[in-house]
């Protein structure tokens, strides 16, 4: 048993951290493999993560960790049985990939604009709350060849886009993600996306 | 009421052994990692060893290391030391203490924040 | 391993004044912000010792208020509000931040 690409791991920044790797053949990762993981820190004990199949050679394993701080460094074993298949470490702080936005709620009953909001994936406590911005991506069932991404380097979870901007009687959806300046991270997954019908017509007179 | 209670101290020729225990109370024992302490007659406090709360990491100071073992039965809420190839300078006052919880992912920190009644161990011949 | 220092090495107090212990280490004690991992202990004679404060600047369950820490990184102290008879003893801070763990050399503080 080989791994052919080792595992890459990534922090959401509050309690999970995700690692994924391949293996040189078909594996049933959950029962033949073991991805053992230590914090570097004073009496802390060996936790034990059950992988799960992530197509036919790849496998990925959901770390059960704390809050993360920027010396954390853990130590990670692979394990097929009693066999050591691989050896490194992880300093989440230095792959983090963030929480996706959740609950992206599309108003369209503001006059003249279609207010778009979501929440905030973290808690204000976690050092990454005042630190993302995001990414709204708005597109058109209807209309293919229509595709905006809107950044919003603002903090507060939400984007106005007047809705003349947008061809009346159509469906359109969005999805947001999220990424954080200041820790380098990489873009989250998108959120769930929301579907809304636009409306909208101009007044008479500007037609 | 959360206690620690030593005992095994005694007096030992040099090279000799002694098994030191030390029975917790009032608390889940096996949550914690444990420490031992050392006083010297007449001196400071001096680090001897460590375990966490399972019982699979264990650490020494360089002075003891390879003379001395610690180990922990949670089954019996109880710490040891055992103590071979004694020295005149082991001589001492030995205590055991609570140190962190050790059932985080990152051990919670409190202090040792609970201290045993302490055995002494006279080393001489 | 890390150094601890203590200063002063003894301490004479009238009681009701104030008193203070300076405790500095070889390297730095913080793990994360607010997580200094040192500890102050005080031995009574005859007594095992006793923990008034952990992680630099949080009072132990029972340890009256006039006991207080501070600092971070390298530079911490103790201080006493108002010294108290029974608060003589030999004072000890401690990094418990990696083994071995280390103790300063011990402050005797004494009623004048």
């Known amino acids: 048993m080989k791994v052919l690409q080792e595992p890459a791991c990534v922090s959401d920044y509050m309690s999970i951290s995700t690692c994924e790797w391949k293996m040189g053949g078909p594996t049933n990762c959950s029962a033949e493999l073991r991805l053992l993981y230590q914090l570097v820190f004073q009496s802390s004990e060996t936790h034990t993560c059950v992988p799960e199949n992530n197509g036919g050679v790849g496998c990925v394993c959901h770390l059960l960790m704390d809050d993360v701080v920027s010396m954390d460094n853990y130590t990670l074993d692979l394990w097929a049985g009693q066999q050591l298949l691989w050896k490194g470490s992880f300093k989440p702080s230095e792959h983090v990939k963030p929480r996706a936005p959740g609950n992206l709620t599309v108003h369209t009953n503001v006059s003249d604009t279609v207010l778009l909001t979501w929440s905030n994936p973290y808690p204000p406590d976690n050092y990454l709350y005042n630190d993302l911005t995001y990414a709204v991506n708005i597109w058109s069932e209807n209309d293919p060849a229509y595709s905006r991404i809107h950044n919003v380097t603002y903090l507060k979870p939400t984007l106005r886009i007047p809705a003349s901007t947008l061809k009346s009687g159509i469906s359109y959806r969005a999805r947001v993600r999220a990424w954080a300046q200041h820790y380098n991270t990489t873009w989250s997954e998108w959120s769930p996306s929301t579907k809304w019908y636009n409306s909208y017509r101009e007044p008479f007179e500007q037609r | 009421e959360v206690q620690l209670v030593e005992s095994g101290g005694g007096l030992e020729q040099p090279g000799g052994s002694l098994r030191l225990s030390c029975a917790g109370s009032?608390?889940?024992?096996?949550?914690?990692?444990m420490t031992w302490v050392r006083q010297a007659p007449g001196k400071g406090l001096e680090w001897v060893s460590s375990?966490?709360?399972?019982?699979?990491?264990?650490y020494y100071a360089d002075s003891v290391k390879g003379r001395f073992t610690i180990s922990r039965d949670n089954s019996k809420n109880t710490l040891y030391l055992q103590m071979n190839s004694l020295r005149a300078e082991d001589t001492a006052v030995y205590y055991c203490?609570?140190?962190?919880?050790?059932?985080?992912?990152?051990?919670?920190?409190?202090?040792?924040?609970?201290w045993g009644q302490g055995t002494t161990v006279t080393v001489s011949s | 391993d890390i150094v601890m220092t203590q200063s002063p090495l003894s301490l004479p107090v009238t009681p009701g004044e104030p008193a203070s212990i300076s405790c500095t280490s070889s390297q730095s004690l913080l793990y994360s912000i607010g997580y200094n991992y040192v500890d102050w202990y005080l031995q009574k004679s005859g007594q095992s010792p006793q923990l008034l404060i952990y992680?630099?600047?949080k009072r132990a369950s029972g340890v009256p208020d006039r006991f207080s820490g501070s600092g971070s990184g390298t530079d911490f102290t103790l201080k006493i509000s108002r010294v108290e008879a029974e608060d003589v003893g030999f004072y000890y801070c401690m990094q418990a931040l990696q083994t071995p763990y280390t103790f300063g050399q011990g402050t005797k503080l004494e009623i004048k």
């Open positions: 009032g608390f889940t024992f096996r949550d914690s990692a």
């Open positions: 203490a609570k140190d962190r919880l050790s059932i985080y992912i990152r051990p919670r920190y409190y202090g040792l924040d609970v």
């Open positions: 375990i966490s709360g399972s019982g699979d990491g264990t």
């Open positions: 992680l630099g600047n």
